[in-house]
Amino acid sequence: LVPHLGDREKRDSVCPQGKYIHPQNNSICCTKCHKGTYLYNDCPGPGQDTDCRECESGSFTASENHLRHCLSCSKCRKEMGQVEISSCTVDRDTVCGCRKNQYRHYWSENLFQCFNCSLCLNGTVHLSCQEKQNTVCTCHAGFFLRENECVSCSNCKKSLECTKLCLPQIENVKGTEDSGTT
């Protein structure tokens, strides 16, 4: 099966790499613009230069192209705790990330929020915090994992999943209650 090509891809595939088909004359292949520039005017004829102009401040192109406009620079989302790792340049978009000891939680493919890495209090670090994943904690005896925090088994209600992990403690509490009734 041949993958479906869009009109632009079809047109480009007729020309050698680094060139594109003139939109008004399909017998002409024009040289693509370098990254950091955009297409101002198509080449007037074979072997003649494409008119490429540098992207203005606040815009960029990250690869060779024949775009009529540069792309707008992304802005880091302060409300999501993001910080700017590197500024936008004419040939590279803004790079956003998180502060030290934080990880990214992706709400969607393009939208992430920064959260503090768990410290594993009352437990030990099983897997260290990574760029896109929180620390994985293992809890000490007498504690159970709830929302990635080690919580005392005294907070474990019988109806909750923690009963398996806190079984000895729950039995002790039950035993104390029973002995109090005699």
Partner: nanobody, 122 residues
Framework: EVQLLESGGGLVQPGGSLRLSCAAS????????MGWARQAPGKGLEWVSF????????YYADSVKGRFTISRDNSKNTLYLQMNSLRAEDTAVYYC???????????????WGQGTLVTVSS
């Protein structure tokens, strides 16, 4: 058919509290990020909060941080918004939404409830 039904709105004095609920049906609730948005009279839609499918991650708008708490009960297919220290500027219609993260970044709206009105006034 996806249905989201909000309740719990009403008239409350400044400094008071309300708890909004959103009963969901017609889809596997525990698989979806859910959220709350609001629209004040004559203003645009504002994202208030959202929560991921297992309740581990939450987002709050700066305007409600420390006052509002989002939570969910996947066993009851219900989303909640606990609103404390309410202010006049919190007056709005509050909407429950499925997959709010997409609407947040690109105004692609999936499923919304009909809204519940919260009025903060003395």
């Amino acid at each position: 058919e996806v249905q989201l039904l909000e309740s719990g709105g009403g008239l409350v004095q400044p400094g008071g509290s309300l708890r909004l609920s959103c009963a969901a049906s017609g889809f596997t609730f525990s698989d979806y990020t859910m959220g709350w948005a609001r629209q004040a009279p004559g203003k645009g839609l504002e994202w208030v909060s959202f929560i991921d499918s297992d309740g581990l991650h939450t987002y709050y708008a700066d305007s409600v941080k420390g006052r509002f708490t989002i939570s969910r009960d996947n066993s009851k297919n219900t989303l909640y918004l606990q609103m404390n220290s309410l202010r006049a500027e919190d007056t709005a219609v509050y909407y429950c939404a499925q997959n709010p993260q997409y609407a947040y970044e690109s105004s692609r709206f999936d499923y919304w409830g009909q809204g519940t009105l919260v009025t903060v006034s003395s």
